[in-house]
Interface confidence: low
Amino acid sequence: ERLPLTPVSLKVSTNSTRQSLHLQWTVHNLPYHQELKMVFQIQISRIETSNVIWVGNYSTTVKWNQVLHWSWESELPLECATHFVRIKSLVDDAKFPEPNFWSNWSSWEEVSVQDSTGQDILFVFPKDKLVEEGTNVTICYVSRNIQNNVSCYLEGKQIHGEQLDPHVTAFNLNSVPFIRNKGTNIYCEASQGNVSEGMKGIVLFVSKVLEEPKDFSCETEDFKTLHCTWDPGTDTALGWSKQPSQSYTLFESFSGEKKLCTHKNWCNWQITQDSQETYNFTLIAENYLRKRSVNILFNLTHRVYLMNPFSVNFENVNATNAIMTWKVHSIRNNFTYLCQIELHGEGKMMQYNVSIKVNGEYFLSELEPATEYMARVRCADASHFWKWSEWSGQNFTTLEAAPSEAPDVWRIVSLEPGNHTVTLFWKPLSKLHANGKILFYNVVVENLDKPSSSELHSIPAPANSTKLILDRCSYQICVIANNSVGASPASVIVISADPENKEVEEERIAGTEGGFSLSWKPQPGDVIGYVVDWCDHTQDVLGDFQWKNVGPNTTSTVISTDAFRPGVRYDFRIYGLSTKRIACLLEKKTGYSQELAPSDNPHVLVDTLTSHSFTLSWKDYSTESQPGFIQGYHVYLKSKARQCHPRFEKAVLSDGSECCKYKIDNPEEKALIVDNLKPESFYEFFITPFTSAGEGPSATFTKVTTPDEHSSM
């Protein structure tokens, strides 16, 4: 007859931190040296035995004299309520065919975690619990006095729970968030009426979820050490030593070696000299709550990250070439390096690739003279490209060369009695053509009528003009720029003995915001080009004199520059250049890039005042120095009369008042007789010029009273 195999010696211990019950028992009457498959049913009750909250089965193989263990984790902190546990068993083994029957239940084992001792009337659990963000947590309070009203708050916000018995209320916190690394504050307050009886709080330590390490990668620079790096993601460390920062361990499966990493985002792995080429690394991140791991498999020779090249030098540097040399750290015999050179200079970047063994050399050609360059080099494994090394660079400057272009030269010729005054201008050579620092300009003046006669003027840089007084002969003038190496080609200009073409009429032109669009009739005969020069009409010519060269087949150009200002008049002259380099004035033009309304009104005089008329005149008003071409004048007249005088028409002023207006369309007509007036009458007038942009500024009217018929003025 089979004896019932009843669980005996049931002991229950607790782990408050883990909120777990640990059951320990043995099975009596088991056959010696036999193993049986058994099922144990476990019942757990809370507060009282009849309140069963959990039932479950645990299957295992049981030996004689074996102590069995099983654990259960409670959602509710164990301090919140008494728990009761009992167990029964069933043989579920083929050695014992049916009928199988359950044993009797063991007696209830009471589990009470007494942490509500002392004089306090209120307790909150669990204390200092560590959980992961997003988990569900149950907390409770235990109140000694059931007459007390207890309110609980999570980070200051009231929470509501479920009463388990008159002394205990539980609160389910769903998907708890991470708030701060020093924990989430929860407190409860007991009160009777409006009187506080006491307050208790706990800190719930919510850890951020441990992330899988990202961007895990290993590389070597010397075949001695592998340098592994990763992005650890969020640090899961919590305050008060509740949870340290996650730890990282490297495991290499081929060698079976393991290393605890002492840094949060990198670890060095010693490469043993046993010619292991393939590595299979697992990086394990671990904190108190979970583990995460990532894997990489690679061939060592495919993960070479070289140290940056060194000893970068430049040899045989001249104006247009240089030899760049460098060294690389030798890491293995017969290793081929792929190196990339970057050359930066004059706002440009060139890139070159070269394969080398030990020392690098590259011939840099087609360089600009007198230019500072920055050259840098980086290298990688040519056989299995993984990653470029860091750059190593150095600056060098090419030597100067003779200037490569003639200066751009122009002139202003003014006729004085018996001679020409020639003001010669030149533009500084661009860096591209100067090929170094321009030190001086040589101006050679040669009298074409007396070929043996010539003069040399040496003008130190940075001067860009000079004045020559020449007699009424023809002259050839050469301008040459010089630097420390040599001279530029000469720029040649010829000054004719004949005076400039005086008969050229000046034409008015209208500019735009973009500048001035100019066109002209081609010069008869052969021309080698045209020159357009210009300056501010009102200023000294030398102040802002500019010119532009135009090709021989072009008879129009647009002069656009930021220097053109609204309300400023510019004078343009267009010259043709003959094959003999003699300039002939073809056309003159004048205009504004943008006309403005007149800046002032004329000073008006009242003449010949009679009982029936008066004369207005403003002879002194200059039309030249205005911010636009004066097109004429508006004469405004006010009187008591309802009707406007002949030639005047009704107008409304900006203030809304009515008056009479007369328009003069000739800017040089600077007088007006106002007649048909009544004696002893009161009149007011105001005169303003106008341009295409509008009238001059508004001003006060001037008052005039006509005398009686018998008076004489």
Partner: antibody
Framework: QVQLVESGGGLVQPGRSLRLSCAAS????????MHWVRQAPGKGLEWVSG????????GYADSVKGRFTISRDNAKNSLYLQMNSLRAEDTALYYC?????????????WGQGTTVTVSS | DVQMTQSPSSLSASVGDRVTITCRAG??????LNWYQQKPGKAPKLLIY???TLQSGVPSRFSGSGSGTDFTLTISSLQPEDFATYYC?????????FGQGTRLEIK
């Protein structure tokens, strides 16, 4: 080179306070945990307190808990130990030590120590 | 707290000897165990960390082994400069604890 220099030690009466400082140089201070370890005359080593690289984890020996406070200022490369309610048994040579990692692993660099004497 | 017990407390040996010092933890500390050497009037020096990893610059005659609760420090061939006091230390849990020390003297 890597160096730790302690200061702030001296003679103090029981119940009074003292603040120790440790100036670090030659390494990236905020990449490592730091410790205070003491040695009473003729005795062995006793760990006093430790602080992780970002101050997220702090630990104390039971004998000093509630009286001593460890802190660090990464911007100043400095470690501190505020000692309150000093007792005669706190008399010792106090070492500042650098950990090999960001948490508590092992102490690879030590200062020369500063002496604290608690006596009436 | 994890109690660390070193044995022997003191030890006499000669230059060239092989010496072993043991350290026992009151509970498992995994491999979170370090060994230090201290000479009179000097600060301690880290010899071995993680039970068996030799600290950079430490001679290879020093070695460590063990895991869990039992650990050993071995000096394969004593040199004159090795006579000092040796401490084990666990960093498995706080508070960190040291052994009471083993004094190694010249015989």
């Amino acid at each position: 080179q890597v160096q730790l220099v302690e200061s702030g030690g001296g003679l103090v009466q029981p119940g009074r306070s003292l603040r120790l400082s440790c100036a670090a140089s030659g390494f990236t201070f905020d990449d490592y945990a730091m410790h205070w370890v003491r040695q009473a005359p003729g005795k062995g080593l006793e760990w006093v307190s430790g602080i992780s690289w970002n101050s997220g984890s702090i630990g104390y020996a039971d004998s000093v808990k509630g009286r001593f406070t460890i802190s660090r200022d990464n911007a100043k490369n400095s470690l501190y130990l505020q000692m309150n309610s000093l007792r005669a048994e706190d008399t010792a040579l106090y070492y500042c030590a650098k950990d090999i990692g960001v948490y508590y692993y092992g102490m690879d660099v030590w200062g020369q120590g500063t002496t604290v004497t608690v006596s009436s | 707290d994890v109690q660390m017990t070193q044995s022997p407390s003191s030890l006499s040996a000669s230059v060239g000897d092989r010496v072993t010092i043991t350290c026992r933890a009151g509970q498992s500390v995994g491999t979170y165990l370090n060994w230090y050497q201290q000479k009179p009037g000097k600060a301690p020096k880290l010899l071995i960390y993680a039970a068996s990893t030799l600290q950079s610059g430490v001679p290879s005659r020093f070695s460590g082994s063990g895991s869990g609760t039992d650990f050993t420090l071995t000096i394969s061939s004593l040199q004159p400069e090795d006579f000092a006091t040796y401490y084990c230390q666990q960093s498995y849990s706080t508070p960190i604890t040291f052994g009471q020390g083993t004094r190694l003297e010249i015989k």
